[in-house]
């Protein structure tokens, strides 16, 4: 029986690629593919990297799990029963089919994917205690990694630009994080939801208190990372709020940094193109736009003061009385969906007051946010009992290899 153990690999030079949470051979069939294509694949963070062979250290493709919706088991066409080697990964804008060598390998892939996207060890897969232990280790690593990263729905935009983005591109999501504007380490959350037939934009303050982020709602909620902040908003609206995610294709557009002639600051510049602007969320079958079901879903908890939340000014910065009022966004033009144009960057410096951080790569290997999903498929358990002894031996071998 084929094993999920790693075949021998040429050691990778240090610093070339991060070690994978899990890796094995995997056959992949995307929405545009006629047939399955075999890769060596590794999961790291929220990205599956695909290599031509298990000796390569340069990936040829990668798949971001930021728009994860669910995993399902696949019964191959023409089959009457589930052979246990096919599964489907459903993202917000596409479905990818996978084929592996064994049922064990399939359950491992599903388990590790669910661990990183849901930040919990799945309990309803056919996995051994050793597998679950490995997943709990990965969970700890992923939580530590997330605590240090900025979610991809964090954009270096102003309050008005945030509202404008959510209004113009509802299909990309309806929640984004942005700088707070009070000069502190905090952030603001901008959301757009349907309320009584009108789209309403809301802004929430998230204050930095030591190592924690505190969401300023009626009962202030403390989070360990910005990622957790996003998860709070997603989960407290039963997924009515969807983190703003940009199209993978824009990663291919190269920008460059040049010094602003006026003040010497570095400014991120993307190649320009004519026309009204890009449509950043394209490709693959689309689910319903996030806005379509929002009026049926619960809003966030009430704010402490619908009129204003006061933020203590930091240093010489102006006092910003942060608004948590609703803003009905009614005066917007019809947006044409033009041909794709190069992507302006996430973080655009706007002098003259202070330089902004360096440009952010949206679909960088390790830096994506996800809408949390609780969709759990049912998995077959028959026929696995006789594998137990063999699996445990393999696990012991694997642990020995890794330590």
């Amino acid at each position: 029986m084929a094993s999920a153990l790693r075949p021998p690999r040429v050691p990778k030079p240090k610093g070339v690629l991060p070690s994978h949470y899990y890796e094995s051979f995997l056959e992949k069939k995307g929405p545009c593919d006629r047939d399955y294509k075999k890769f060596w694949a590794g999961l790291q963070g929220l990205t599956i990297y695909f290599y031509n062979s298990n000796r390569d250290f340069q990936h040829v493709e990668k798949l971001n799990l930021g728009a994860f919706e669910k995993l399902t088991d696949e019964i191959p066409w023409g089959s009457s029963r589930d052979p246990g080697t096919h599964f489907s990964l459903i993202l917000r804008d596409q479905e990818i089919k996978f084929k592996v060598e064994t049922l064990e390998c399939r359950e491992m892939w599903k388990g590790f994917i669910l661990t990183v996207v849901e930040l919990r060890v799945p309990t309803d897969l056919t996995l051994l205690p050793g597998h679950l232990y490995m997943m709990s280790e990965v969970l700890a690593k992923e939580e530590a990694r997330r605590a240090l990263e900025t979610p991809s729905c964090f954009l270096k935009v102003s309050r008005l630009e945030a509202q404008l983005l959510l209004e113009r591109y509802p299909e990309c999501g309806n929640l984004l994080l942005r700088p707070s504007g009070d000069g502190a380490d905090g952030v603001s959350v901008t959301t757009r939801q349907m309320h009584n037939g009108t789209h309403v934009v809301r802004h929430y303050k998230v204050k930095r208190e030591g190592p924690k982020y505190v969401i300023d709602v009626e009962q202030p909620f403390s989070c360990t990372s910005l990622d957790a902040v996003v998860n709070y908003f997603v989960s407290h609206t039963k997924k009515a709020l969807v983190p703003f995610l940009l199209d993978e294709d824009y990663e291919k557009v190269l920008g460059y940094v040049e010094a602003d002639k006026e003040n010497g600051e570095n400014v991120w510049v993307a190649p320009s193109a004519p026309g009204p602007g890009p449509a950043p969320c394209t490709g693959g079958p689309k689910p319903l736009s996030p806005a379509s079901s929002q009026d049926k879903l619960p809003p966030l908890p009430p704010l402490p003061n619908q009129e204003e939340n006061y933020v203590t000014p930091i240093g010489d910065g102006p006092a910003v009385d942060y608004e948590n009022q609703d803003v009905a966004s009614s005066s917007w033009p019809v947006i044409l969906k033009p041909k794709k144009l190069p992507k302006p960057p996430a973080k655009l410096p706007k002098p003259p007051v202070g330089p902004k951080p360096e440009p952010k790569v949206f679909n960088g290997g390790l830096g994506r946010k996800l809408p949390v999903s609780s969709a759990q498929p049912l998995f077959p358990t028959a026929g696995l009992a006789d594998m137990t002894a063999e699996l445990q031996k393999k696990l012991e071998k694997r642990r020995a290899l890794e330590h």
Partner: antibody, heavy 124, light 107 residues
Framework: EVQLLESGGGLVQPGGSLRLSCAAS????????MGWVRQAPGKGLEWVSG????????SYADSVKGRFTISRDNSKNTLYLQMNSLRAEDTAVYYC?????????????????WGQGTLVTVSS | DIQMTQSPSSLSASVGDRVTITCRAS??????LNWYQQKPGKAPKLLIY???SLQSGVPSRFSGSGSGTDFTLTISSLQPEDFATYYC?????????FGQGTKLEIK
């Protein structure tokens, strides 16, 4: 030195069209949102339209929605305002203005640089 | 739309006077308010952003205050070059709106 230079204004009949241009120099044009603000003779300032640096999101005043189109060409450092179905009440000096976000100390926008304006007269 | 109302619409004062112009928003706009100065035949010039922050290069005799719906622009000691029209503008939400202006004239 930051400079904004409007052009394209002139006399046009009601129902006619004009295209205003604003040539920007002295700063990295692609990194800033931009806007058009107009001022009818002897009147106050009226915001007309804005275009974001970020994905070129656009917004319009109700009075011009459906008739005016704002656009930009970053390769030419130029902002445009296509004005169709012009009316007498569109007669004004049209200013191009740079919108900036004040960095870490504030998340609002303000027009920090303005062009000298171009006069559009709609009359039969 | 958010309406911005300035008062007074015109004001006569002398060099050295302390002058205050007020601006009221039809709904709370937090501190998303800017003040501009415009002289005849010229483009407007940004004086104050975020209700109270002085734009670079603007003399310190200009100051702004307020939050929510009520804002003031104060010129502590009028200089001859300050006689102009002053506008407030909200950047809380689109459409961006200006006050009708306050014309400051020499007494």
């Amino acid at each position: 030195e930051v400079q904004l230079l409007e052009s394209g204004g002139g006399l046009v009949q009601p129902g006619g069209s004009l295209r205003l241009s604003c040539a920007a120099s002295g700063f990295t044009f692609s990194g800033y949102s931009m806007g058009w603000v107009r001022q009818a003779p002897g009147k106050g300032l009226e915001w007309v339209s804005g275009i974001s640096s970020y994905y070129y999101g656009t917004s319009y005043a109700d009075s011009v929605k459906g008739r005016f189109t704002i656009s930009r060409d970053n390769s030419k450092n130029t902002l445009y305002l296509q004005m169709n179905s012009l009316r007498a009440e569109d007669t004004a000096v049209y200013y191009c203005a740079r919108s900036w976000t004040v960095g870490s100390s504030w998340d609002g926008d303000a027009f920090d640089y303005w062009g000298q304006g171009t006069l559009v007269t709609v009359s039969s | 739309d958010i309406q911005m109302t300035q008062s007074p619409s015109s004001l006569s004062a002398s060099v050295g006077d302390r002058v205050t112009i007020t601006c009221r928003a039809s709904q709370s706009i937090s501190s998303y308010l800017n003040w501009y100065q415009q002289k005849p035949g010229k483009a407007p010039k940004l004086l104050i952003y975020a209700a109270s922050s002085l734009q670079s290069g603007v003399p310190s005799r200009f100051s702004g205050s307020g939050s929510g719906t009520d804002f003031t622009l104060t010129i502590s000691s009028l200089q001859p070059e300050d006689f102009a029209t002053y506008y407030c503008q909200q950047s809380y939400w689109y459409p961006l709106t200006f006050g009708q202006g306050t014309k400051l004239e020499i007494k």
